[in-house]
């Protein structure tokens, strides 16, 4: 069902004009008619789904609110080009408080940025550059601070397996001053929307609404969320069946936690609890030593029915990840555990996201991991 594509095209065509002035109305009505046409085209395959009916009713409401006629010109969807660098897409009246770097410079030097990522089976890179492989089945808090909350749901990659991967991701951007209303972003397997759950693509109706915005980089596969009011960039991808998450966030925001007992336990900050960690390096060493296809002693789970021989896994991972760092080792582990070649891409893109988001270029590759206590 392609209704989300219609939603994205409509929001793209009308971004920055929630309540267009009367002289904007013809253009807005043209965009609405295009939206209506798009939804009609999806009727056959979407007619039974909530998203379709929400769109249809939303269009009817907007048509009547703006006195749009059903007949008339339609608009061409805008080409999805990347926004230029800088703040050209932000409203000129966006208050300074809604641009983290500008407001931060008033009382300090350039902020220190940190990175956290979750990908594959899943592998976690914390804000302090610890690298862990975790079980964490079910719903877990990835980030929980005063500004946003990120929760992931991990499901077993194979029946009876301890190895899991991320099947659902929920991000709640909390209401913040005159910048943004509370916004919720939700992605699931085979549903990577380029909009918040309310259909919008920015922070709402406040002055600084465009200090939070979603950009679709690759339809259904790659979304970027910029939250400039907290100096934060989030990258969400669907790779194969599962989701990956990466974030760049200032230390000040990372540590903006009021209740350390409850909030401070989140995975990106503290890592996975010890009983949830998998010693994948031992697995890797065992695999290398034996070359065996099934490594029950070291494996965290029943091996996949169609896993790769060790040599094949190594070759496939080397192809995408020539540096034998922890991302490469994670790739090998995932192929041996799941037999799903898409995990190679998950590790590759996770490293690409580190290159884009990590502020310390000397720490792109991690080579050693200590299975230490969280915290």
């Amino acid at each position: 069902c392609k209704i989300l594509k219609c939603n994205s095209e409509f929001w793209s065509a009308t971004s920055g004009s929630h309540a267009p002035a009367s002289d904007d109305t013809p253009e807005f009505c043209a965009a609405l008619r295009s939206y209506a046409l798009c939804t009609r085209r999806t009727a056959r395959t979407c007619r039974g789904d909530l998203a379709y009916h929400s769109a249809v009713h939303g269009i009817e409401d907007l048509m009547s609110q703006h006195n749009c006629s059903k007949d008339g010109p339609t608009s061409q969807p805008r080409l999805r080009t990347l926004p230029p660098a800088g703040d050209s897409q932000e409203r000129s009246d966006s208050p300074e408080i809604c641009h983290y770097e500008k407001s931060f410079h008033k009382h300090s030097a350039t902020p220190n940025y940190t990175h956290c990522g979750l990908f594959g089976d899943p592998h976690l890179r914390t804000f302090t550059d610890r690298f862990q492989t975790c079980k964490v089945q079910g719903a877990w808090p990835l980030i929980d601070n005063n500004y946003l909350n990120v929760q992931v749901t991990n499901t077993p990659v194979l029946p009876g397996s301890a190895a899991t991967a991320t099947s659902k991701l929920t991000i709640i951007f909390k209401n913040f001053q005159e910048c943004v209303d509370q916004k919720v972003y939700q992605a699931e397997m085979d549903e990577l929307p380029a909009a918040f759950v309310d259909g919008s693509k920015n922070g709402g109706d406040k002055h600084g609404a465009n200090s939070l915005k979603i950009t679709e980089k690759v339809s259904g596969q790659h979304v970027e969320i910029q939250a400039k009011y907290i100096g934060t960039t989030i990258v969400v991808r669907q790779v194969g069946r599962y989701l990956t998450f990466a974030v760049r966030m200032p230390e000040e925001v990372v540590n903006a936690v009021e209740d350390w007992d409850s909030q401070g336990l989140y995975l990106c900050l503290r890592g996975c609890p010890l009983n949830q960690q998998i010693d994948f390096q031992a697995f890797h060493t065992n695999a290398e030593g034996t070359g065996a296809r099934r490594l029950a002693a070291a494996s965290p789970a029943p091996t996949a029915p169609e896993t790769f021989p060790y040599e094949t896994a190594v070759a496939k991972c080397k192809e995408k990840l020539p540096v034998e760092d922890l991302y490469y080792q994670a790739c090998v582990f995932d192929l041996l555990t799941t037999g799903d070649v898409n995990f190679t891409l998950a590790a590759y893109y996770a490293l690409e996201d580190v290159k884009m988001l990590h502020s310390n270029k000397d720490k792109l590759h991690l080579y050693e991991r200590t299975r230490d206590l969280p915290g």
Partner: antibody, heavy 115, light 112 residues
């Protein structure tokens, strides 16, 4: 991971009734239309019918119209197929599938109608 | 009802070779503005069907790029560029343009 698990199948006599269930997980069940599809032994696939996300509309194949009823309970993430006046030609594996047009399918449940 | 006729009924190919199968509809499957709701499913032995291709040529999530769907109107083709062992099973075409929704009778792919 999207999972659909059918249950309630078995051996019944012609003319009797049976109610199948399909429990969904791994996606927001209440957002999606759902389908029932069947496959007679050693035969191809036959679409039975579909139900909208909110039960507002239901569509059926002519072969089951008036005898089969599709329903759902969104609070329980469960889809149902109530089958009345069963005939021998209704013997099949019954699958539930997610979406207005099916993408993910359950593993199926066998229904045998025989005297 | 729309009748979908699949040919051949069975197909035996060597691993690594190309396989091609056809699905012909009794009426046009074009819905509106060029949208054509024809899908392809694969049912592997002992398993439930899995979606491969939707809207004639779009690969579903996780489907390898060796599966190529094409066609328009009433004639559709599924090609597998390099057949692998896991590709064996029965391939069904399916149309969602007209009610009732209908399946083709299937093409069985076997490995030589």
């Amino acid at each position: 991971e999207v999972q659909l698990v059918e249950s309630g199948g078995g051996l019944v006599q012609p003319g009797s009734s049976l109610k199948l269930s399909c429990v969904a997980s791994g996606f927001t069940f209440s957002n999606y239309g759902m389908n029932w599809i069947r496959q007679a032994p050693k035969k191809g696939l036959e679409w039975i019918g579909m139900i909208y996300y909110d039960s507002s509309e239901k569509h059926y194949a002519d072969s089951v119209k008036g005898r089969f009823t599709i329903s759902r309970d969104n609070s329980k993430n469960t889809l149902y197929l109530e089958m009345n006046s069963l005939r021998s030609e209704d013997t099949a594996i019954y699958y539930c599938a997610k979406g207005t047009t099916p993408d993910y399918w359950g593993q199926g449940v066998m229904v045998t109608v025989s005297s | 009802d729309v009748v979908l006729t699949q040919t051949p009924v069975s197909l035996s190919v060597t691993l690594g070779d190309q396989a091609s199968m056809s699905c012909r509809s009794s009426q046009s499957l074009e819905y509106s503005d060029g949208y054509t709701f024809l899908e392809w499913f694969l049912q592997k032995p002992g398993q439930s069907p899995q979606l491969l291709i939707y809207e004639v040529s779009n690969r579903f999530s996780g489907v390898p790029d060796r599966f190529i769907g094409s066609g328009s109107g009433t004639d559709f083709t599924l090609k597998i560029s390099r057949v692998e062992p896991e590709d064996l099973g029965v391939y069904y075409c399916f149309q969602a343009t007209h009610d009732p929704l209908t399946f083709g009778s299937g093409t069985k792919l076997e490995i030589k």
